[in-house]
Amino acid sequence: APVRSLNCTLRDSQQKSLVMSGPYELKALHLQGQDMEQQVVFSMSFVQGEESNDKIPVALGLKEKNLYLSCVLKDDKPTLQLESVDPKNYPKKKMEKRFVFNKIEINNKLEFESAQFPNWYISTSQAENMPVFLGGTKGGQDITDFTMQFVSS
């Protein structure tokens, strides 16, 4: 079956947008006006995985780039990275588990839990201009809640 991908942007619960910081890193910061054009547009693919009403498995690629958010162990710690893939083979319905996130909607916020590392979430710092990372705590200082704005292709 073909994989369907929809374009979207993300903002954390403090309204910080996500932008590229170097070739393989995302950072979160407040943007306004014309600067909003800097924000990363994701291509979110609906992929194979365990699904429920509140939890949908997705992969998050960067629009028109062969880069996907993935979760790997680095120095024995689950880590978020941007991974380069062969565009001839991606996206696909059955993505490797490191690329899969459970998009969980709770009230009016979204969380993105790593399928590879349960209870680890895409996170941002309270501070401005800091890297987007994989965090193992919810409800603490770090931010794990997002809103999503779908955009036309």
């Epitope: 369907r4 009230n107 916020k109």
Partner: antibody, heavy 119, light 107 residues
């Protein structure tokens, strides 16, 4: 029985604002994504706004982006469409519609509320 | 944006006739297509989703086929209550656009 009842339509001047409501019953409103679809008199259908079940995701096509906002109150089983900076071309019947989880088809529609933008 | 072209824009037919409506898309949408029926003064109603799956309560005289860029809605034996407007809609990529509609009238 699934029921969607729109209200809030009426006559408004160009540049004005209007807020539409859609009261839902007969299903667990908080578990469904919702949308607004409009139909200009004698014309076809145009999707104008989407909101996910909890309100964490939204979508607006370019024709209304920046002018329309969509929201919901799951405690009140109600969907809203706030329309600002209205133009003559926004004149239409506005339908609220229930959508399935992954942004796909509309399985139930309300009967619509008419919005007329004219001076 | 994916463009949706329905044909014909209108047709006249008699009760008992077999009626076919076509929807073409400007890009490959696989089977991500829906058909709706709208009677005058009423809201649209879901007929078919995923190109060929009948919605609950829809009579079996309605059928859908096609994939990729060309799709067909067929009414095998037109009934008096079938005189209405019919719309296709894709849901492959944003925005999910509708066809311009086909009006099925009584001959």
């Amino acid at each position: 029985e699934v029921q969607l009842v729109e209200s809030g339509g009426g006559l408004v001047q160009p540049g004005g604002s209007l807020r539409l409501s859609c009261a839902a019953s007969g299903f667990d409103f908080s578990r469904y994504d919702m949308s607004w679809v409009r139909q200009a008199p004698g014309k076809g259908l145009e999707w104008v706004a989407y909101i996910s079940s909890g309100g964490g995701s939204t979508y607006f096509p370019d024709t209304v982006k920046g002018r329309f906002t969509i929201s919901r109150d799951n405690a009140k089983n109600t969907l809203y469409l706030q329309m600002n900076s209205l133009r003559a071309e926004d004149t239409a019947m506005y339908y609220c519609a229930r959508q399935n989880k992954k942004l796909t088809w509309f399985d139930y529609w309300g009967q619509g509320t008419l919005v007329t933008v004219s001076s | 944006d994916i463009q949706m072209t329905q044909s014909p824009s209108s047709l006249s037919a008699s009760v008992g006739d077999r009626v076919t409506i076509t929807c073409r898309t400007s890009g490959n949408i696989h089977n991500y297509l829906t058909w709706y029926q709208q009677k005058p003064g009423k809201a649209p109603q879901l007929l078919i989703y995923n190109a060929k799956t009948l919605a609950d309560g829809v009579p079996s005289r309605f059928s859908g086929s096609g994939s990729g860029t060309q799709f067909t809605l067929t009414i095998s034996s037109l009934q008096p209550e079938d005189f209405a407007n019919y719309y296709c809609q894709h849901f492959w990529s944003l925005p999910f656009t509708f066809g311009q509609g086909t009006k099925v009238e009584i001959k």
